[in-house]
């Protein structure tokens, strides 16, 4: 969380943002709020980036003002119009791209004052990992799937019950490169797995954290999974 | 200290070509947006090109849009300005420099010294 | 393209006088404007950032203001050294602009 002050005259006012990750060709979110304004038409919301001269997104007089936008975010940026009057500055960001990783600024300027907060917006890929028994392999295997990830992770096994026992020995991870040549498709096998036993595969790396837990007893198999971006922490 | 030194001015005959380049030293380099500016004899400042920090845009003035191309080599630490076509107007003192802080609403904090490009036959 | 105007185009005046510049925008540049001194042969010096914030290292007598389109440089006590020309700028749009400048001359 970062809370950025800015003086216009006497006057500042209060931008808050929150650091966040985009995953690449997917949608995102670059968070901003502020002390709102009465009027809309008193309401300026710029987003600026690290180093790019053109604005990332302008607001003002209660709609998109783009005649300043940089061309690399051109037909990508929106803000939550209906939202502006009660604070909301974020910026919704079409299709991320790798290149849109960086600082960002949220500048604010009403009736009231002016104010700015910036944010660290962190581009990759991740996905959340399934896990599945592998009744093709000669011993009992299971197979950990994860279909976009990038910057290559790290994939460790753990299981509930040998706790801290180290796997890397009896598991195998491969990351094969997608069609559009950025992303991988990540699978890991473990070997020799027992039942009546939870493992966990654990794929990470510096944007996100994704587990895919699998039960397997004699009777049934019980699957969980859950992912959780690591830089949308306040700082 | 922060430095930008700029080489590779000269004579050169109208239709020729000219690199320039602008060596930095003591700042990071690939976080800052550079520019050239120029400035003819006896005249004002008039803002010529500029280079995102990581080099993905570029901006350029409409009087060389089409002639001049601005590069960065952040392996070099160095900016490069290549002008083709040259015209007696581009005649000029070029100088290069870095834009304030971190985003595209601040001014010029540091400059070179210039370089001189007479463009005559 | 933004057009930035500067007036005067040349002043006199004494040491110790109260100086003051103005640059207007063709169009509103809220805060993204800058004011540079210029010595002949040297190159440009940055004064003041968004419009009213002074540079490290420049002296106090040395202020902005102004937001939207209209801008002033104010020089509150004219020193020797600061008989130069002086230049607005706007970053708010490629293409950047600069005023025709203002030379500051001794009466």
């Known amino acids: 969380l970062i809370i950025g002050f800015g003086i216009s005259g006497r006057h500042s006012i209060t931008v808050t943002t929150v650091a966040s990750a985009g995953n690449i060709g997917e949608d995102g979110i670059l968070s901003c709020t502020f002390e709102p304004d009465i009027k809309l038409s008193d309401i300026v919301i710029q987003w600026l980036k690290e180093g790019v001269l053109g604005l990332v997104h302008e607001f003002k007089e209660g709609k998109d003002e783009l005649s300043e936008q940089d061309e690399m975010f051109r037909g990508r940026t929106a803000v939550f119009a209906d939202q502006v009057i009660v604070g909301n500055a974020s910026l919704r960001l079409k299709n991320v791209q790798l290149t849109d990783a960086g600082t960002y600024k949220c500048y604010i300027i009403t009736s009231k004052g002016k104010g700015n907060a910036n944010l660290e917006y962190k581009t990759g890929a991740f996905s959340m990992p399934e896990v599945n028994v592998d009744y093709n392999a000669s011993s009992e295997t299971l197979r950990c799937e994860a279909p976009r990830w990038f910057p290559q992770p790290t994939v460790v096994w753990a299981s509930q019950v040998d706790q801290g026992a180290n796997f890397s020995e009896v598991s195998n991870t491969s990351f094969e490169l997608n069609s559009e040549n950025v992303t991988m498709k990540v699978v890991s096998v473990l070997y020799n797995v027992t039942i009546n036993n939870t493992y966990s595969c654990m794929i990470e790396n510096d944007i996100a954290k994704a587990t895919g837990d699998i039960k397997v007893t004699e009777s049934e198999i019980k699957r969980r999974s859950h992912l959780q971006l690591l830089n949308s922490k306040a700082s | 200290e922060v430095q930008l030194l700029e080489s590779g001015g000269g004579l050169v005959q109208p239709g020729g070509s000219l690199r320039l380049s602008c060596a930095a030293s003591?700042?990071?380099?690939?976080?800052?947006?550079m520019h050239w500016v120029r400035q003819a004899p006896g005249k004002g400042l008039e803002w010529v090109s500029a280079?995102?920090?990581?080099?993905?845009?570029?901006y350029y003035a409409d009087s060389v849009k089409g002639r001049f191309t601005i590069s960065r080599d952040i392996s070099k630490n160095t900016l490069y300005l290549q002008m083709n076509s040259l015209r007696a107007e581009d005649t000029a003192v070029y100088y290069c420099?870095?834009?304030?802080?971190?985003?595209?609403?601040?001014?010029?904090?540091?400059w070179g010294q210039g370089t001189t490009v007479t463009v005559s036959s | 393209d933004i057009q930035m105007t500067q007036s005067p185009s040349s002043l006199s005046a004494s040491v110790g006088d109260r100086v003051t510049i103005t640059c207007r925008a063709s169009?509103?540049?809220?805060?993204?404007l800058a004011w540079y001194q210029q010595k002949p042969g040297k190159a440009p010096k940055l004064l003041i950032y968004?419009?009213?914030t002074l540079q490290s290292g420049v002296p106090s007598r040395f202020s902005g203001s102004g937001s939207g389109t209209d801008f002033t440089l104010t020089i509150s006590s004219l020193q020797p050294e600061d008989f130069a020309t002086y230049y607005c700028?706007?970053?708010?749009?490629?293409?950047?602009?600069f005023g025709g400048g203002t030379k500051v001359e001794i009466k």
């Open positions: 420099a870095r834009l304030l802080g971190r985003f595209g609403e601040y001014g010029m904090d540091v």
């Open positions: 003591g700042f990071t380099f690939n976080t800052h947006a």
């Open positions: 280079i995102s920090g990581s080099g993905g845009s570029t």
């Open positions: 169009r509103s540049i809220y805060t993204w």
């Open positions: 968004d419009a009213s």
């Open positions: 700028q706007q970053s708010y749009s490629t293409p950047y602009t």
